[in-house]
């Protein structure tokens, strides 16, 4: 029984090639995260899944695929606002010793120019576990299609936990959701990234818990001006 | 076998050091987070911090603030907890505890260790 | 902190017994609390995570409920095995992670 990690319950396999800004952060040969594509040199990814040394794989649906390329990443820069206790501010930029090679099986990412509203639905994507809260981890990407929960709604459920920066999405009486080897994994809404995965209740999947995600709209001066300090 | 071996019973004198470890197998360690927990004789629990097996992450009780340090040898799978300056009501059952959770946030203690007896006495 | 005060502290019960414990929080913690059992120089064992759900592997006579600050853990007909000490503890504000003073079910 895992945690760290994430995964998606109740997806299915992502159309092939629909995700060419997705990435894997690997601990060695393990999964430990998901991740995006901002540009050749950035990924996007939650803080939580800091490591001292990445190895991203990029450019295949398919984890282990010999195609895809895997590029060492040794420097992260963690939002300064995160915290460890109340896991606000839950996102981080990993810088990749060598420049991602860009193609119609890896390109980057929409930040968003606005949040979405409500209501939206959205793609949430990764090799987390598909099963909770034993483990199944699948080779192949997974996608699970959500929609964006209101403030007031989530608070319902996770009371005082949610922070205004963390974003809220699920399907109602539904188990749909991210989960453990999801996690800094993409929500993407109309083509453009509104959520990188944080949190949510464990067993994953459980009906009426909605997935909590790091509301990427609410950073983007902090995405640029971070890239453009460390190039 | 998913579980946590820790190492075995301690006796040190006040003001001394203990460092106790936690070895675990059967699963992916740095996928984790290890919380330690300890037991005074005939007491109840008492929470001592955490930490996070991949980034190093720790948060420790407040009343432990400067005497107790939590790290991790990701190449081992083993976690340590040192606590400084030994007291004699430190003596103590100390558990490492495996917390299930997704993503940032962890919601119960799945497993534990078999308990470290650290007996302090002059 | 959020304090979690158990009662009763001790309890004598007969086998085949109902046995209720309770568990109050000085402030609402939602669904987010546990209960673990615990024998003479054992480590805790989960039984209960989330106020209801029932760790795999835990007999169905144990059942939690309870919401907001008061919970309770019911073992719906005692069994031999079952005298031990009882705990439970709160991961909903954390840290600290905070575990209320015990119960220890002991033979009538």
């Known amino acids: 029984e895992e945690a760290q990690g994430d995964k998606i319950i109740d997806g299915a396999p992502c159309a092939r090639g629909s995700h060419p800004w997705q990435v894997a952060l690997l601990s060695g040969n393990q999964l430990h995260c998901g991740g995006v594509l901002v540009n050749e040199r950035w990924v996007l990814t939650a803080a939580h899944c800091k490591m001292n040394e990445y190895t991203v794989h990029l450019g295949s649906d398919t984890l282990g695929d010999r195609r895809a390329q895997r590029i060492k990443a040794s420097k992260s820069f963690r939002h300064p606002g995160y915290s460890t206790q109340t896991h606000v501010n839950d996102l981080m930029l990993v810088k990749l010793n060598s420049q991602a090679r860009l193609s119609s099986m890896v390109k980057k990412v929409r930040l968003p120019s606005r949040c979405e509203p409500p209501g939206t639905t959205c793609t949430v994507s990764g090799w987390g576990t598909t099963t909770s809260p034993d483990v199944t981890f699948p080779s192949d990407l997974m996608c699970v299609d959500v929609k964006l929960i209101s403030p007031q709604d989530c608070t319902k459920v996770y009371k005082d936990l949610l922070e205004n920066s963390m974003l809220c999405a699920g399907i109602p009486d539904s188990k749909k959701n991210a989960c453990n080897g999801d996690s800094g994994g993409p929500l993407v809404c109309r083509g453009t990234l509104q959520g990188l995965v944080s949190w949510g209740t464990f067993p994953c999947g459980q009906p009426n818990d909605p997935g909590v995600y790091t509301q990427v709209c609410k950073f983007t001066k902090w995405i640029n001006d971070t890239m453009k300090k460390h190039r | 076998q998913v579980q946590l071996v820790q190492s075995g019973a301690e006796v040190k004198k006040p003001g001394a050091s203990v460092k106790v470890s936690c070895k675990a197998s059967?699963?992916?360690?740095?996928?984790?987070?290890i919380h330690w927990v300890r037991q005074a004789p005939g007491q109840g629990l008492e929470w001592m911090g955490s930490?996070?097996?991949?980034?190093?992450?720790?948060n420790y009780a407040q009343e432990l603030q400067g005497r107790v340090t939590m790290t991790t040898d990701t190449s081992t799978s083993t976690a340590y907890m040192e606590l400084r300056s030994l007291r004699s009501d430190d003596t103590a059952v100390y558990y490492c505890?495996?917390?299930?959770?997704?993503?940032?946030?962890?919601?119960?203690?799945?497993?534990w260790g078999q308990g470290t007896m650290v007996t302090v006495s002059s | 902190d959020i304090q979690m005060t158990q009662s009763p502290s001790s309890l004598s019960a007969s086998v085949g017994d109902r046995v209720t414990i309770t568990c109050r929080a000085s402030?609402?913690?939602?669904?987010?609390l546990n209960w673990y059992q615990q024998k003479p120089g054992k480590a805790p064992k989960l039984l209960i995570y989330?106020?209801?759900s029932l760790q795999s592997g835990v007999p169905s006579r144990f059942s939690g409920s309870g919401s907001g600050t008061d919970f309770t853990l019911t073992i719906s007909s005692l069994q031999p095995e079952d005298f031990a000490t009882y705990y439970c503890?709160?991961?909903?504000?954390?840290?600290?992670?905070?575990f209320g003073g015990g119960t220890k079910v002991e033979i009538k």
């Open positions: 402030q609402s913690i939602s669904s987010y």
């Open positions: 989330g106020a209801s």
């Open positions: 505890a495996r917390a299930a959770g997704y993503g940032a946030r962890h919601w119960y203690f799945d497993l």
């Open positions: 059967g699963y992916t360690f740095t996928s984790e987070g």
């Open positions: 503890d709160q991961f909903y504000s954390t840290p600290p992670i905070t």
């Open positions: 930490i996070s097996a991949s980034s190093g992450d720790t």
